[in-house]
Interface confidence: low
């Protein structure tokens, strides 16, 4: 689901198409209705519409299942621990929650793409807000993790000690608060719009062109560029420090967080490049023509799908890169499968029994 702006009455880039209380696909948006008819033509959208109908429901259904299982497993492993969570683990728990909440909305958008929005305006607002809250939260929490690691390693500052979790909790609350703020447009402007001609309803925004561009810029900057810049800056410094100190164990310990950040960049960069093209077309810096518009529509669908895959990717990364995660997951499964065989709950052979599975432990770097 790529939430963008449409008043659901105007065709693509054509005011006159406004004629037309029209139905645009959920991924193709027009401008506000106006009396100055016909400033540019509606573009034929058969390819992008059919592509969305075929591609998105299948993809979203798959991501829903994978995301729910994977992030559920991550949350279960983290919450099953008896010791206090490290700062990074706490952020990762929140990340798993954010990803889970995001994938929970995917079946709704799958139905919207395939048929129509059948869930009413209330759920349209909630699902849209949930979607964007968790889109932003995912990016910002990854930025928090990298900043935490940066302080911890580069400045040897343990901002979030294992003791009182107040700071990490406050940081997470601030992230969620900020995301709620970013999602205000969803609560205000999203609604289930019924199209009298097609007798179909879709969950869409209802505000003008300037709002559409502003929202896209916010998404690009707050949801991608800023977090990515923070991550890049922090990890560049961390790697420099670790390389200078020849800390091979430390470097190994950094694998997971670096891989998670690289995955974020790889998954979301294509989508945001497409959004950037769209912004440039909105602002008139790039000529808007029908061929380009159609390609952008399809590219948006494909790259947003790639972006949502990121929700399912983190658990896989933990499973394949994080040794401790695999061990704890195995133990959890054994415990669930054999509740009476307490002997199976042995700690793994690692010397640091309480070290974090996700990060460079504050005391030692044997966490992975």
């Amino acid at each position: 689901m790529v939430l963008e702006v449409s008043d659901h009455q105007v065709l693509n880039d054509a005011e006159v198409a406004a004629l037309l209380e029209n139905f645009s696909s959920s991924y193709d948006y027009g401008e506000n209705e106006s009396d100055s008819c016909c400033t540019s033509p509606p573009c034929p959208q058969d390819f992008s519409l059919n592509f969305d109908r075929a591609f998105l429901p299948a993809l979203y259904s798959l991501l829903f299942l994978l995301g729910l299982l994977g992030n559920g497993a991550v949350a279960a492993v983290l919450l099953s621990r008896r010791t206090a969570l490290s700062s990074t683990d706490t952020f990762l728990l929140h990340l798993a929650v954010a990803d889970t909440l995001l994938v929970l909305t995917l079946p709704l958008w799958a139905v919207d793409a395939a048929v129509q929005w059948v869930f009413g305006s209330g759920l349209c607002k909630v699902a849209g807000a949930l979607f964007n809250i968790n889109f932003y939260a995912g990016a910002l929490l990854l930025a928090c993790i990298s900043f935490d690691r940066y302080l911890n390693i580069v400045h040897a500052t343990q901002l979030y000690r294992r003791g009182p979790p107040a700071r990490v909790t406050l940081t997470c609350l601030a992230v969620w608060g900020l995301c709620l703020l970013f999602a205000l447009p969803d609560f205000i402007f999203l609604s289930a719009h019924h199209d009298e001609r097609l007798n179909a309803t879709h969950c869409q925004y209802n505000f003008p062109q300037v709002g559409r561009t502003a929202l896209r810029v916010l998404q690009l900057v707050a949801g991608f560029l800023l977090p990515l810049l923070v991550m890049a800056y922090c990890y560049a410094h961390i790697l420099a420090v670790l390389l200078v100190s020849r800390g091979q164990r430390r470097l190994r310990a950094m694998r997971l967080v670096v891989v998670v950040v690289v995955a974020f960049a790889l998954c979301w960069t294509p989508y945001h490049l497409v959004v950037l093209v769209d912004i440039l077309m909105d602002l008139g810096a790039l000529a808007r023509n029908c061929g380009r518009e159609s390609r952008v529509d399809v590219a948006k669908s494909v790259t947003s799908g790639l972006g949502y895959m990121h929700c399912c990717l983190n658990p896989l990364l933990y499973a394949f890169v994080g040794v401790k995660f695999r061990e704890r997951m195995w133990m959890l499964l054994l415990r669930l499968g054999c509740p009476n065989q307490r002997g199976l709950q042995r700690q793994p052979s690692s010397s640091r029994r309480d070290s974090s599975w996700s990060e460079t432990s504050e005391a030692s770097y044997s966490g992975l």
């Epitope: 009455q9 065709l11 693509n12 054509a14 005011e15 006159v16 198409a17 406004a18 004629l19 037309l20 209380e21 029209n22 139905f23 645009s24 696909s25 209705e33 100055s36 008819c37 016909c38 400033t39 540019s40 033509p41 509606p42 573009c43 034929p44 959208q45 058969d46 519409l49 009298e196 001609r197 097609l198 023509n289 029908c290």
Partner: antibody, heavy 123, light 106 residues
Framework: EVQLLESGGGLVQPGGSLKLSCAAS????????MSWVRQTPGKRLEWVAT????????YYPDSVKGRFTISRDNSKNTLYLQMSSLRSEDTAMYYC????????????????WGQGTTLTVSS | DIQLTQSPAILSASVGDRVTISCRAS?????IYWYQQKPGQSPKLWIY???NLAPGVPARFSGSGSGNSYSLTISSMQGEDAATYYC?????????FGGGTKLEIK
Amino acid sequence: EVQLLESGGGLVQPGGSLKLSCAASGFTFTSYAMSWVRQTPGKRLEWVATISHGGTYTYYPDSVKGRFTISRDNSKNTLYLQMSSLRSEDTAMYYCARHPIYSGNYQGYFDYWGQGTTLTVSS
Amino acid sequence: DIQLTQSPAILSASVGDRVTISCRASSGVNYIYWYQQKPGQSPKLWIYFTSNLAPGVPARFSGSGSGNSYSLTISSMQGEDAATYYCQQFTSSPYTFGGGTKLEIK
């Protein structure tokens, strides 16, 4: 079969008024945006007005804005064009035309035209 | 307003001839639409989105072009193709039509 039948044309004096009608059949009238297009005696085609399928939105070129009003009665499957302050240059054959729907969008061209009704503005 | 200029205004062709009608726009347009009108009849949609033939239009017709220059081509002129052809743009307000090209049989 799509049919559009215009009526109401005639001879009017400059400054006078006239209302054209277009009876639609053979398709779901309420689903389509409709327009009036005129053809001058010199055979030039000019777009005159457009109305959205629900009747909420109307559009006009500057040449007729303020003088012509397009409307529709979806219960009667009928399109109207109320013309006032008529001028000699409004003399033309007036066609009612349907906007097609393509991939879920209305388009700016016309896929069906009526046979037309003639308006002559002359003193 | 975008002006559409059709050329030639009148064109005589023999059966079997390849015929090309031109439509030039005063500024760039995304698509051109073509209509055929025979004497005593209303216009009929002939080509939409520059190159798509309307239902029932023979395959000998084709449309092409981009930007400011568009054309309608008949690969092999037939008697029933004698008519006036109009181009139309929907890129900017108002909708405008070309002046028409009257295609006659020699």
